[in-house]
């Protein structure tokens, strides 16, 4: 019969675990929120302003379902920041754009791990930074949607 | 049918101004790039610029920046492209064209401008 | 300033297949055009952002990209095809560049 010791020590585990789920969960959605704010920004970029922004070539994953897959966004997120840095205006203002992928970063490492040595296999394919968006949009969606609650 | 339409051929003398047209019909022209590239006899195409007509927001190449001025009214539908003092090197063929999708889709028929010294 | 370099002329008998190169140090990070121009007229886009091709162009036009080069291939080369061939991308600054130009004769 399992002792009180362990039975406290499995619900201890149990609780870091569950802890552990709603923080991952927190920060999907976070960066879930930050990806769709960027693009509701481009789209609504003076509308037709847009095509300016659709010269720049994105790299996307050859597959990507788990969170070290996270390691391909964080590899894209500084010609990202060079797209938003060209295309601020009047019409498309990022008050911090540096800060804005800063946090992206953030999320995404705390995501994924500090680990570094997992190597992205990208797509031969490239991709707009709309299409970019969407396709890391759609990955926390599932993600997040496929997460014990 | 999306077109662009361009002014007539254009005969001048060095020194003289000059400002020809492109008129866009069959899209909503305010929310649409226009560009203008030259071609000058027997030789490739050149990006000179390009407008946005909605507020004129104006990008120069940096071969025709202060060599030309681009300007449009929307009213119209119609984008320009106008020199202050025409050299002989000036004499090409300019095309206008729409920018959609982050490439030139439409084309005009272009406007050839002579200048003879 | 920026360049697209791509070779002067290609030459290619009909029902075979022609493939123009445009090279340029920004291409990695950005997409390629090419345009069709037959003499005298006004230049058609035929290949965006790489590999896609607008409505109305023939499925023989294709387009590819590895590094800093990208290629437009022609297969089933026919006598229409006979024309300039530009490609276009925009530097790092946002500028819109065109390469040389290739001359692409239909032999025979």
């Known amino acids: 019969a399992p002792t009180s010791s362990s039975t406290s020590s499995s619900t201890a585990e149990a609780q870091q675990q569950q802890q552990q789920q709603q923080q991952q969960q927190q920060h999907l959605e976070q960066l879930l929120m930050d990806l769709q704010e960027l693009l509701s920004r481009m789209e609504n970029y003076r509308n037709l302003k847009l095509p300016r922004m659709l010269t720049f070539k994105f790299y996307l994953p050859k597959q990507a379902t788990e969170l070290k897959d996270l390691q391909c966004l964080e590899d894209e997120l500084g010609p990202l920041r060079h797209v938003l840095d060209l295309t601020q205006s009047k019409s498309f203002q990022l008050e911090d754009a540096e800060n804005f992928i800063s946090n992206i970063r953030v999320t995404v490492v705390k995501l994924k791990g500090s680990d570094n040595t997992f190597e992205c296999q990208f797509d031969d394919e490239s991709a707009t930074v709309v299409d970019f968006l969407r396709r890391w949009i759609a990955f926390c969606q599932s993600i997040i949607s496929t997460s014990p609650q | 049918e999306v077109q662009l339409v361009q002014s007539g051929t254009e005969v001048k003398k060095a020194g003289d101004s000059l400002k020809i047209s492109c008129k866009g019909s069959?899209?909503?022209?305010?929310?649409?790039?226009i560009g203008w590239v030259r071609q000058m006899p027997g030789r490739g195409l050149e990006w000179m610029g390009t407008?946005?007509?909605?507020?004129?927001?104006?990008r120069y190449s940096p071969s025709f920046q202060g060599q030309v001025t681009m300007s449009a009214d929307k009213s119209i539908s119609t984008a320009y492209l106008q020199w202050g003092s025409l050299r002989a090197s000036d004499t090409a063929m300019y095309y206008c064209?729409?920018?959609?999708?982050?490439?030139?889709?439409?084309w005009g028929q272009g406007t050839m401008v002579t200048v003879s010294s | 300033s920026y360049e697209l370099t791509q070779p002067p002329s290609v030459s290619v008998s009909p029902g075979q297949t022609a493939r123009i190169t445009c090279s340029g140090d920004?291409?990695?990070?950005?997409?390629a055009y090419w345009y069709q121009q037959k003499s005298g007229q006004a230049p058609v886009l035929v290949i965006y952002?790489?590999?896609k091709r607008p409505s109305g162009i023939p499925e023989r036009f294709s387009g590819s990209s590895s590094g800093t080069t990208v290629t437009l291939t022609i297969s089933d080369v026919q006598a229409e095809d006979d024309a300039d061939y530009y490609c276009?991308?925009?530097?790092?600054?946002?500028?819109?560049?065109f390469g040389a130009g290739t001359k692409l004769t239909v032999l025979g």
């Open positions: 952002q790489d590999t």
């Open positions: 920004a291409l990695p990070r950005k997409f």
């Open positions: 064209a729409r920018f959609s999708s982050s490439a030139y889709d439409i």
């Open positions: 069959g899209y909503n022209f305010d929310t649409y790039w």
């Open positions: 407008i946005y007509p909605a507020d004129s927001d104006t």
């Open positions: 276009q991308s925009a530097d790092r600054s946002d500028s819109y560049v």
